[in-house]
Interface confidence: medium
């Protein structure tokens, strides 16, 4: 029987810079029954707090609300392990939420085939941003990715759409279908999932080349 | 037939400033991303920025961020690059091309040489 | 440090075939961003040879083409001629710059 390993936080995300969550592994166990707490204070303050919702998240998780976000305020943070044998601490993480916002995947994709009759036919992508993301603030530029390709190929083909919220391409094979997919990530941040697979058709008289 | 053509290069002193602009026919100029790429004598092609085709989004290379600022002029069909703050390192042949679809630049102009230098 | 690295240069006889490599990293090509192929002629402004990894533009001779594979893409170019002797650059969108990246160019020459 031995005291606790020590933890690790390992990850924090916030789905739009109003709420936040932090993981973290457990060391070993000891052999004995072990609690788990995480401590934090704001940076320029010497106030310890304990975490605010540990049920939110998950196991070994914690939560922070609202009314514990601050996206102007660096968060410093610790997780304590605890057994009948003694503590450990994890490392000290810094969290500042700007840096951590992992949207949800962009919503409302919709794929379609246009054909001019003066130009060449193309594919007209478009898409709307999740719905936690308040883009009126101008506290987010959100950016886009699109990816696409024939059902049966192995590789995709990925686009950087920038801030825009609809795309075109030009030359796709005639006849096949294909699958196309879109994410976003704040500028600060991580890439969400890919949303769902839209699949379309591709005529078989779609012009291939300029 | 499409075509665009710069102007506005010069001789400019270190911190000096300068406006490119690029003429654009040929084609509807206000359907389409433009881009504005520079070559440094006997160097390869670095890209500086680019803007969509109402002037909503813009991006810039790290190198020139906070010191040139692209905008366009849909009812005049040019693009333009302000160019402040400049250093000896600016010095190159800067292009404006068209950004077809995956913003690949698809047709370009000739040039124009801007020179910063003491 | 995000580069697309080529080869500075490449030679051929005419009626050869040469291929120019570009080799990125998982923050540009292995990520999955296109490329595309410019040609630049002596004295002339750059040119659109292949876009989308392996699409020519109408007007660009099939003797050119293009091809990607993990974290690199190649420019084939057979039949070669005269014509031909150009700088050739690669170019990608790079996730970690948020920007256009362009290879430091290949000098094709036609012996």
């Known amino acids: 029987q031995l005291p606790p390993g020590k933890p690790e936080i390992f990850k924090c995300r916030s789905p739009n810079k109003e709420t936040f969550t932090c993981w973290w592994r457990p060391g070993t166990d000891g052999g004995l029954p072990t609690n788990y707490s995480l401590t934090y204070h704001r940076e320029g303050e010497t106030l310890m707090h304990e975490c605010p919702d540990y049920i939110t998240g998950g196991p070994n998780s914690c939560h922070f609300g609202k009314q514990y976000t601050s996206m102007w305020r660096t968060y410093i943070m610790m997780v304590n392990a605890t057994n009948q044998m003694g503590s450990s601490f994890s490392d000290e993480l810094y969290v500042d939420v700007t840096y951590i916002v992992q949207p949800d995947p962009p919503l409302e994709l919709a794929v379609e085939v246009k054909q001019p009759e003066d130009r060449k036919p193309y594919l007209w992508i478009k898409w709307s941003p999740p719905t936690l993301i308040d883009l009126k603030t101008g506290w987010f530029t959100l950016l886009y990715e699109i990816r696409l390709k024939p059902e049966k190929a192995a590789e995709w083909e990925i686009h950087f759409a920038g801030q825009q919220t609809e795309f075109k391409i030009l030359s796709l094979h005639p006849g096949q279908k294909y699958l196309v997919q879109v994410r976003c990530k704040p500028d600060h941040g991580y890439w969400s999932a890919w949303s769902p697979a839209t699949f379309i058709q591709i005529p078989s008289d779609f012009t291939m080349n300029d | 037939e499409v075509q665009l053509l710069e102007s506005g290069g010069g001789l400019v002193q270190p911190g000096g400033s300068l406006r490119l602009s690029c003429a654009a026919s040929?084609?509807?100029?206000?359907?389409?991303?433009m881009h504005w790429v520079r070559q440094a004598p006997g160097k390869g092609l670095e890209w500086v920025s680019d803007i969509s085709s109402a002037s909503s989004y813009t991006n810039y290379a790290d190198s020139v961020k906070g010191r040139f600022t692209i905008s366009r002029d849909n009812s005049k069909n040019t693009l333009y690059l302000q160019m402040n703050s400049l250093r000896a390192e600016d010095t190159a042949v800067y292009y404006c091309a068209r950004g077809l679809d995956a913003r690949r630049m698809d047709y370009w102009g000739q040039g124009t040489l801007v020179t910063v230098t003491s | 440090q995000s580069v697309l690295t080529q080869p500075p240069s490449a030679s051929g006889t005419p009626g050869q075939r040469v291929t120019i490599s570009c080799t990125g990293s998982s923050s540009n090509i292995g990520y999955g961003y296109v490329v595309h192929w410019y040609q630049q002629l002596p004295g002339t402004a750059p040119k659109l040879l292949i876009y989308r990894n392996n699409q020519r533009p109408s007007g660009v001779p099939d003797r050119f083409s293009g091809s990607k594979s993990g974290t690199s893409a190649s420019l084939a170019i057979s039949g070669l001629r005269s014509e031909d002797e150009a700088d050739y650059y690669c170019a990608a969108w790079d996730d970690s710059l948020n920007g256009w990246l362009f290879g430091g160019g290949t000098k094709l020459t036609v012996l």
């Open positions: 040929g084609f509807t100029f206000s359907s389409y991303w």
